[in-house]
């Protein structure tokens, strides 16, 4: 749980955050796990600790290993582990899988590629972007803050994109690169006002007290990939996260399905151990895109117990 994988290239800067989070005022000590030797905090060292961050300026292959961070409050010490691997620079253009960050998908309407890990660094715009090692040039490519936007995305825009930026530490500059794959969904699509497929508006669902129940909010937004298309549940007009009821959880992530070419999104509200007070709540399925917001309301009612009357002759 409190171990995190990090990687980088030799002669580049690498900054790693302690996986164990604490209040910002807490002291963080870093150690080489194998030797238990403390990592210095003085910035004149090539590898040094700076609060929650461990900095390799620049990194060397020999830095690879497990690092221990101990977050210290006035009364508690809590431990995390950073598993760091530094690789030699590749002689050719090929970026091996082990250096790749998570793949992102895009379409004509949504082509943002975020530069991974950049938030950890002290950098200034603009970012440099490369595709398959070639510098990106032309008006179709816009480096905006920490991401790249591609206009009029086409299928041959798929590939490996590398962001390159300069980390500045006390006036010294260090190069950082990070690569991720970009895939393109090839659909000519359109967007329209959301249509909620489920639940029906003002629907009532029968439930049994003490049982679990699921409510599905499903809406379609047009055809093909959508720039903005979200569905969510609200309880009495409040976000689920603001409701502070651990029994009622909205499914993490949203399932995107394409039925008959339509872009439809579902999210499930899971209610564990249904209580009487759940019957008093208003459950709103909200579907939102650039065209607007549509809302369908569903309420829960107690399932009538089946009569089990015996007939005596």
């Amino acid at each position: 749980k409190f171990s995190k994988q990090s990687w980088g290239l030799e002669n580049e800067a690498l900054i790693v955050r302690c996986p164990r989070q604490g209040k910002s005022s807490y002291i963080v000590d870093w150690y080489y796990s194998q030797t238990n030797k403390s990592i210095p905090t003085q910035e004149r060292n090539r590898v040094f600790a700076s609060g929650q961050l461990l900095k390799f300026l620049p990194a060397e292959v020999a830095d690879s290993g497990i690092y221990t961070c101990i977050v210290r409050s006035p009364t508690f010490n809590r431990t995390g582990y950073a598993n760091v691997t530094i690789y030699k620079k590749q002689p050719d253009c090929n970026v091996p899988d082990y250096l790749m960050y998570s793949t992102v998908s895009g379409s004509e309407k949504n082509s943002k590629i975020y530069c991974p890990t950049i938030d950890l660094y002290n950098w200034t715009a603009p970012l440099e972007w490369f595709k398959n090692c070639q510098a990106l040039q032309g008006s179709r490519y816009k480096a905006h803050k920490s991401f790249l936007v591609i206009d009029n995305v086409m299928t041959d825009d798929a590939g490996d994109y590398t962001c390159k930026f300069i980390h500045n530490e006390n006036g010294a500059n260090y190069s950082v690169t990070a690569t991720r794959s970009f895939t393109v969904k090839d659909e000519q699509g359109f967007s329209r006002f959301p249509v909620i497929r489920a639940p029906a508006h003002n629907e009532t669902k029968e439930v049994e007290i003490g049982e679990n129940t699921n409510l599905t909010c499903s809406a379609c937004f047009g055809k093909g990939a959508q720039f903005l298309a979200t569905v969510q549940w609200q309880l009495n007009g409040n976000k689920i996260t603001d409701f502070s009821e651990p029994r009622i959880q909205q499914e993490e992530g949203q399932n995107q399905s394409f039925s008959n070419g339509l872009a439809c999104v579902n999210t499930v509200l899971r209610i564990a151990d249904v209580k009487e007070e759940d019957l008093l709540l208003r459950y709103d399925c909200l579907a939102l895109n650039l065209h607007g917001l549509r809302r369908h309301t569903i309420r829960l009612s107690r399932k009538n117990p089946i009569d089990h009357q015996s007939t005596y002759c």
Epitope: K1, Q21, G22, K23, S73, T75, F76, R78, T79, S244, P246
Partner: antibody
């Protein structure tokens, strides 16, 4: 020295109300999450409610939701528990306690506890 | 909610003996588990956090182990002041839950 001192307990009839207070000293009250835990006579510990530090988000056990309200006044270093519609099963010693670590979305242990205040719900 | 089951309910031992208390979670709590000691008429006192770390001022005879769903509190050699009720508590998710307690009594 960290100190938590509960007050406001007593005998109340079913359906009645009580407001418990917990006066904190010896630490920067506003940055810590605070918790109420209760213990029925001869029974185990039961978490009742939590409140975040400056953010103020609140959490409740199912058994008290809709009847109890946790709040805090950081300017007075005081935690409160407003208890309405009291039932016989709410009879317990109520402790306030401090969560010394929790960050948004997480919880931790209770490192300091008050001495408790007894709430008796009976007709 | 996560249910914590402690065993045994009561442990009858003599001073100087080793006490082994168990706490089992209904689902994984990683290492987000604590142990408390409570004496009659007193508030609980934190002994162990993150499954195995001793809280400040807790004697070395108290140790915690385990992760996931099975946890153990061990008192290596019981002192007279150790006879009390011990509770485990998980804090991986709300609602925070406690075990029902294990009473360590003098044999």
């Amino acid at each position: 020295e960290v100190q938590l001192l509960e007050s406001g307990g007593g005998l109340v009839q079913p359906g009645g109300s009580l407001r418990l207070s917990c006066a904190a000293s010896g630490f920067t009250f506003s940055i810590y999450d605070m918790i109420w835990v209760r213990q029925a006579p001869g029974k185990g510990l039961e978490w009742v409610s939590s409140i975040r530090g400056e953010g103020g988000g609140t959490y409740y056990a199912d058994s008290v939701k809709g009847r109890f309200t946790i709040s805090r006044d950081n300017s007075k270093n005081t935690l409160y528990l407003q208890m309405n519609s009291l039932r016989a099963e709410d009879t317990a010693v109520y402790y306030c306690a401090r969560d010394p670590w929790s960050t948004e979305g997480s919880f931790f242990v209770l490192d300091y506890w008050g001495q408790g205040t007894l709430v008796t719900v009976s007709s | 909610e996560i249910v914590l089951t402690q065993s045994p309910a009561t442990l009858s031992l003599s001073p100087g003996e080793r006490a082994t208390l168990s706490c089992r979670a209904s689902q994984s709590v990683d290492d987000d588990l604590a142990w408390y000691q409570q004496k009659p008429g007193q508030a609980p006192r934190l002994l162990i956090y993150d499954a195995s770390n001793r809280a400040t001022g807790i004697p070395a005879r108290f140790s915690g182990s385990g992760s996931g769903t099975d946890f153990t509190l061990t008192i290596s050699s019981l002192e007279p002041e150790d006879f009390a009720v011990y509770y485990c508590q998980q804090y991986i998710t709300a609602p925070l839950t406690f075990g029902q307690g294990t009473k360590v009594e003098i044999k």
